[in-house]
């Protein structure tokens, strides 16, 4: 019988209140055997899909979205979803992204690096996925 | 259907240099981590390099025996993977497979190019 | 380095029985391992994958068990193809090891 597959995780490094043009990254985290890792904009319209996952740990394995220069059109909700033959996950919890204007100074108190939880992590709609893997990549919007 | 196809083994002398090639089509390659492995005649499996996606930096891992001789590239643009290997020893010679990574797997590896390093 | 033994080196077995082998890892691995089999003349191919998960178009007679540091391959009810060599490989760190191979001979 199919195994039940576990609630994948999100977070950001280094965290998720960004300056404007600083980088991001977006860290999704599942179990072993994992093929695919999709990181969801806002609704399931917009996404971006990575094979290229690595472990985390002895039982769990993870993928990384990462976004170079962050814009103000960043700013969102993000979650993430991953398939592991012959099925989808369920979606994560939301992970809010929060873009902000750059101040300069060194002392402005960002999100603590790698923060997935407190105020800004919304919980998913816990809809399930039945769309298939994009084997090819990109079959939406790109995210960024 | 998934192809990897490798190229510019070849017979080359000790202390040479030589650059392998592999063409990947039939899959979206700028979204998987890529590998060579590497099989002398008549011996097992030994994994040489493997670089990751941009999302990861490109990050770069390479076995000890080709540390700092051996280079692992990868142009998204055309889908190329490259594995540059300098100051070659007679040690290296194998037969070499392009891999494409699945779930961190090495689940599809391209015919393979034989590389020989003799004097 | 994560040092992966296997065992044994080779095998002799008549059609259509079962035989299993094994893969030791020097420190835990998780589920990070998978099982190829090579053919004469031919690249590896995935067979297993995350030591229990069957690779796509791979027949059922193959399975695998195992987590940590010990694991199995089976192949059940073995046909002429199958008479090849067999690797494990843990891909929980770099470098990538396998094992040394088993290689499976017709009785």
């Known amino acids: 019988q199919e195994e039940d597959l576990p609630r994948p995780s999100i977070s950001a490094e280094p965290g998720t209140v960004i300056p404007l043009g600083s980088h991001v990254t977006f860290v999704c985290r599942g179990p072993v055997g994992v093929q695919t890792f999709r990181l969801e904009r806002d609704s399931r319209s917009t996404y971006n899909d990575t094979e290229d996952v690595s472990q985390a740990s002895p039982s769990e394995s993870e993928a990384r979205f990462r976004i170079d220069s962050v814009r103000e059109g960043n700013a969102g909700l993000y979650r993430c979803i991953y398939y592991k033959p012959p099925k989808w996950s369920e979606q994560s919890d939301y992970l809010e992204l929060l873009v902000k204007e750059s101040s300069g100074g060194p002392d402005s108190p960002d999100t603590e690096p790698g923060s997935s939880a407190g105020p800004t992590q919304r919980p998913s709609d816990n809809s399930h996925n039945e769309h298939a893997p994009a084997s090819q990549g990109l079959k939406a919007e790109h995210l960024y | 259907e998934v192809q990897l196809v490798e190229t510019g083994g070849g017979l080359v002398q000790p202390k040479g240099s030589l650059k392998l090639s592999c063409a990947a089509s039939g899959f979206t390659f700028n979204i998987n981590a890529m590998n060579w492995v590497r099989q002398a005649p008549g011996k097992g499996l030994e994994w040489v390099a493997r670089?990751?996606?941009?999302?990861?930096?490109?990050?770069?891992f390479y076995a000890d025996s080709v540390k700092d001789r051996f280079t692992i590239s990868r142009d998204d643009s055309q889908s190329m993977l490259y594995l540059q290997m300098n100051n070659l020893k007679t040690d290296d010679t194998a037969m070499y497979y392009c891999?494409?990574?699945?779930?961190?797997?090495?689940?599809?590896w391209g015919q393979g190019t034989p590389v020989t390093v003799s004097a | 380095d994560i040092q992966m033994t296997q065992s044994p080196a080779s095998q002799s077995a008549s059609l259509g029985e079962s035989v299993t082998i094994t893969c030791l890892a020097s420190?835990?691995?998780?589920?990070?391992l998978g099982w190829y089999r090579q053919k004469p003349g031919k690249s590896p191919q995935l067979l297993i994958y995350?030591?229990?998960s069957l690779a796509d178009g791979v027949p059922s007679r193959f399975s695998g068990s195992g987590s940590g540091t010990k694991f199995s391959f089976k192949i059940s009810s073995l046909q002429a193809e199958d008479f090849v060599i067999y690797y494990c490989q843990q891909l929980y760190s770099t470098p990538l090891t396998f094992g040394s191979g088993t290689k499976l001979e017709i009785k």
């Open positions: 420190q835990t691995i998780g589920t990070w």
């Open positions: 670089i990751r996606t941009k999302n990861n930096n490109y990050a770069t």
């Open positions: 891999v494409r990574d699945r779930a961190g797997f090495f689940a599809y």
């Open positions: 995350a030591a229990t």
